[in-house]
């Protein structure tokens, strides 16, 4: 029985070694993935961002809520949300792009302007299904008509023109909470993707009848998560064979 005990210990040790080997392999794979991600982001170390900071940075508009409800769908069966499949099994993916600072935008009139968007390599012009610019309009005290204008920045022309209009719309606002408004920018985005050098940024204006700008472009106190952002839906190549 001493032999059998010894044999049992050897077997156990063998199993443990296999476990350790598997665990180490898994750990090194994870580390390799982390290094890849950091190099893609051009970072040496992982950024130290607290949950609170993330919470403040994330947009608070319906698209984000929907993404979260779709994303968490695996954990729970009570939801319908999922990746969208068409008849050919092409899936669409939603990418939320937050504005970043641009040197060019910082120079206009000597003060920062909003907004400049850098795009992920996933966003290719022939794969863009939908592109919406979401902006948050601050609450109004009295019923008012708001004129929303989205301007595209261009290289200064001879006559000094720096902007060209993309979209303008008129909407009525009632007192109460602010509202999120989306504007279709698919064509502009596709042009930017075809000619990246033409992407110099945009300017957002949302003026009420008194000329007050209601658009949140640089969030003030209590306006975390109200930055403008782009919601882009991209599709992958249809795969007829997948079943």
């Amino acid at each position: 029985n001493e032999n059998s005990e010894q044999k049992e210990n050897v077997e156990k040790e063998g199993l443990c070694n296999a476990c350790t080997w598997r665990q180490n392999t898994k750990s090194s794979r994870i580390e390799a993935i982390k290094i890849q991600i950091l190099s893609k982001l051009r970072l040496e170390t992982a950024p130290n961002i607290s949950k609170d900071v993330i919470r403040q940075l994330l947009p608070k508009a319906p698209p984000l809520r929907e993404l979260i409800d779709q994303y968490d769908v695996q954990r729970d069966d009570s939801s319908d949300g999922s990746l969208e499949d068409d008849d050919y099994h092409a899936t669409t993916e939603t990418i939320i792009t937050m504005p970043t600072e641009s040197d060019f935008l910082m120079q206009v009139d000597g003060k920062p302007k909003c907004c400049f968007f850098k795009f992920s390599s996933k966003i290719q012009y022939n794969k863009v299904v939908k592109a919406q610019l979401w902006i948050y309009l601050r609450p109004v005290e009295t019923p008012t008509t708001v004129f929303v204008q989205i301007l595209r920045l261009i290289k200064p022309m001879k006559d000094g023109t720096r902007y060209t209009g993309i979209r303008s719309l008129k909407l009525d606002m009632n007192p109460g909470t602010g509202i999120w408004q989306s504007i279709d920018v698919k064509t502009v985005l596709q042009n930017w993707l075809k000619q990246p050098e033409s992407n110099l940024g945009i300017e957002i204006k949302a003026l009420d009848e008194n000329g007050h700008d209601l658009a949140v472009t640089f969030p003030g106190p209590g306006e975390d998560g109200l930055n403008p952002f782009l919601e882009v839906k991209v599709t992958d190549t249809p795969k007829r064979s997948r079943r």
Epitope: K51, P62, R65, E66, Y71, D72
Partner: antibody, heavy 119, light 110 residues
Framework: QVTLKESGPVLVKPTETLTLTCTVS????????ISWVRQAPGKGLEWVGI???????YYASWAKKRLTISKDTSKNQVVLTMTNMDPVDTATYYC?????????????WGQGTLVTVSS | DIVMTQSPATLSLSPGERATLSCTSS????????LSWFQQKPGQPPKLLIY???TLAYGVPSRFSGSGSGTDFTLTISSLQPEDAATYYC??????????FGQGTKVEIK
């Protein structure tokens, strides 16, 4: 004026299908999530489901097999359809702008419509 | 299933007193702050008071405040007014299309 108004039958027989309509004005349904919440007489609020700005639906687990929420943006209407109604489904049904619990969702509600399930 | 428990079931206080209402969730709300508070008076739809756990909704008096994170939340009415007599509900969001309401706390004014 921004408003939501629920409409539909006041009385439904057991096993029948309930269809309620939420008609909105001053709200663009292509930018706004709409939620349904119900309240049995003398009881608390109960979440029923959502139709998102993009048309996706999310349902409470108890309602998943019986519930369909759809919308017609051009008519400014959101429709709730609940099959196989039971007396325990007797409640005031509310539609609300946004999603209660997310951001400032639930800042605007309809007046509610009382649906009684009885033979 | 997610359970949101509110306590006490009934709170009876005099005008000017401080009211503290509690809401506990069986699991953490999404991002620790997907929580709102609503006030409902008989025969009326609910009214939004607080969102993001602590942000005061537009037009709500400053005597109302919200606090808490994760699973435990508090609604405080610093100085009760007669018009605050109502039932108060918390509502939580959990991701994955899951939302829930607490069973409510009835506030009575003596």
């Amino acid at each position: 004026q921004v408003t939501l108004k629920e409409s539909g039958p006041v009385l439904v027989k057991p096993t029948e299908t309930l269809t309620l309509t939420c008609t909105v004005s001053g709200i663009d349904l292509s930018h706004t999530d709409i939620s349904w919440v119900r309240q049995a007489p003398g009881k608390g609020l109960e979440w029923v489901g959502i139709i998102s700005y993009a048309g996706k639906t999310y349902y409470a687990s108890w309602a998943k097999k019986r519930l369909t929420i759809s919308k017609d943006t051009s008519k400014n209407q959101v429709v709730l359809t609940m099959t196989n109604m039971d007396p325990v489904d007797t409640a005031t049904y509310y539609c609300a702008r946004g999603v209660p619990a997310y951001s400032h969702g639930g800042d605007l509600w309809g007046q509610g419509t009382l649906v009684t399930v009885s033979s | 299933d997610i359970v949101m428990t509110q306590s006490p079931a009934t709170l009876s206080l005099s005008p000017g007193e401080r009211a503290t209402l509690s809401c506990t969730s069986s699991q953490s709300v999404y991002h620790a702050n997907w929580l709102s508070w609503f006030q409902q008076k008989p025969g009326q739809p609910p009214k939004l008071l607080i969102y993001w756990a602590s942000t005061l909704a537009y037009g709500v008096p400053s005597r109302f405040s919200g606090s808490g994170s994760g699973t435990d939340f508090t609604l405080t009415i610093s100085s009760l007014q007669p018009e605050d007599a109502a039932t108060y509900y918390c509502a939580g969001g959990y991701g994955g299309g899951r939302y829930a309401f607490g069973q409510g706390t009835k506030v009575e004014i003596k």
